[in-house]
């Protein structure tokens, strides 16, 4: 995994990744914790600390070396160098700068074989950004008349976000006003009296509740929105798990 905080984090994991084995059980290198290696792309703000890990085992204990863009990564290749903590199978770079961008490959080897894993580091200059919404949320849902349903909108924003849940409604049988704009109803918004604005819960739904639900998030920089559809089925029909799709882009940024 990688950290991208302003401070170097000490390796104080309770689970030790360093595995020693006896001679009778000789083995080529293998990964001991693939969960910590799942995230390959790391976009990190400039000046932060980055840590890449490749927890491995093998007998004899493998050696680890790091490559940058396929070539040997030397201390003199970056101002301030870098730290390698072999017992934690980690590479640590402090105060990253744009020139640190690239592919970082850990090469783990012993006399019985070698394995490698590549991370991609992107160093982003720090700028204010509008809200980013998690792809696929809110997700389409279906329920029977009288059922309950929940829509979730996951928001990432450095700045204070304002969340609104909006539904297209009809007035006098029309979906649009004289100005050509759709009739919209704000169902919930973040504020003093609103608990957990990222979740919209609907109880005891009727056919009238079917339709498109929009999660609209704004901060002082801009806005983002994503939507999902609610299908309300007659009582005798069981809900069908449909393929979840988003009605708008993954995220607006």
């Amino acid at each position: 995994d990688a950290i991208s905080s302003g401070d170097d984090e000490d390796d104080t994991d309770s689970s030790e990744d360093f595995v020693s084995e006896n001679r009778s059980n000789q083995r080529a290198p293998y990964w001991t914790n693939t969960e910590k290696m799942e995230k390959r792309l790391h976009a990190v703000p400039a000046a932060n600390t980055v840590k890449f890990r490749c927890p491995a085992g093998g007998n004899p204990t493998p050696t680890m070396r790091w490559l940058k863009n396929g070539k040997e990564f030397k201390q003199e290749h970056r101002i301030g160098g870098y730290k390698v903590r072999n017992q934690h199978w980690s590479l640590i770079m402090e105060s990253v700068v744009p020139s640190d961008k690239g592919n970082y490959t850990c090469l783990v080897e012993n006399e019985y074989g070698s394995i490698n894993h590549t991370y991609h580091l992107d160093v982003v200059e720090r700028s204010p950004h509008r809200p980013i919404l998690q792809a696929g949320l809110p997700a389409n849902a279906s329920t029977v008349v009288g059922g309950d349903v929940e829509f979730v909108c996951k928001v990432y924003s450095d700045a204070q976000p304002h969340i609104q849940w909006i539904k297209h409604v009809e007035k006098n049988g029309s979906k649009y006003g004289p100005d050509g704009l759709p009739y919209l109803k704000v169902l919930k918004h973040s504020g003093i009296n609103s608990s957990n604005a990222e979740v919209l819960a609907l109880f005891n739904v009727t056919e009238m509740d079917a339709g498109e639900y929009i999660c609209k998030v704004s901060n002082y920089i801009g806005q983002a929105n994503q939507s999902a559809w609610l299908t309300v089925l007659p009582k005798q029909q069981a809900p069908v798990r449909e393929k979840e799709i988003t009605a708008s882009p993954d995220y607006l940024e």
Epitope: P128, H129, A159, Y220, I221, Q223
Partner: antibody
């Protein structure tokens, strides 16, 4: 590189209206709020309001509601602010600023005088 | 409206000195505070946002800290070109209010 170009200085009579512009370039105009800020020696910097060009959503400082009207022309990536019923109190430098207040126009000086 | 108070209208300092400017919000604004530098005849320039994030290209002698209601902007080693007025602003909720400004003079 984002750039905001504001219209030139204005000298107007009390009671009149004025419409100033802010032309954006170098970034996706519709993706960021456009803020308007008033500056006077007495009151300092005052936030007037903002508009989100993608859908025209506006947010105003209560103090400037009825005084300022914010609009955009997406086709020319230009934001506008109209000030109405002008008095000497409206004499100031007016800035437009991109969403995160990270890029500012050079300012438009408005003088209200008879 | 949230009131942002910069207690010092003027501060005098020397080149190489460390200087800190404070700003107090009338209510909790979490870390939603920005700092700007404005030189005579120029537009304000963003230095710090979200209380402590140094904006792209801003020299590392400029730093911001604080959360809740109390915020500090620090120049670790003042340079002659830092002569300017410095403003805080809350971007927690609309209207996004500014402090009255602190004019930094170089002795």
């Amino acid at each position: 590189q984002p750039y905001l170009q504001q219209s030139g200085a204005e000298l107007v009579r009390p009671g009149a209206s004025v419409k100033m512009s802010c032309k954006a370039s170098g970034y996706t105009f519709t993706s960021y709020n456009m803020h308007w800020v008033k500056q006077t020696p007495r009151q300092g910097l005052e936030w007037i309001g903002a508009i989100f060009p993608e859908n025209g959503d506006t947010s105003y400082n209560q103090k400037f509601k009825g005084k300022a009207t914010l609009t955009v022309d997406k086709s020319s990536s230009t934001a506008y602010m109209q000030l109405s019923s002008l008095t000497s109190e409206d004499s100031a430098v007016y800035f437009c600023a991109r969403g995160g207040f990270d890029y500012w126009g050079q300012g438009t000086t408005l003088t209200v005088s008879s | 409206d949230i009131v942002m108070t910069q207690s010092h209208k003027f501060m005098s300092t020397s080149v190489g000195d460390r200087v800190s400017i404070t700003c107090k919000a009338s209510q909790d604004v979490s870390t939603n505070v920005a700092w700007y530098q404005q030189k005579p005849g120029q537009s304000p320039k963003l230095l710090i946002f979200s209380a402590s994030y140094r904006y792209t290209g801003v020299p590392d002698r400029f730093a911001g800290s604080g959360s809740g209601t109390d915020f500090t902007f620090t120049i670790s080693s003042v340079q002659a070109e830092d002569l300017a007025v410095y403003y805080c602003q809350q971007h927690y909720s609309s209207p996004y209010t500014f402090g009255g400004g602190t004019k930094l003079d170089i002795k």
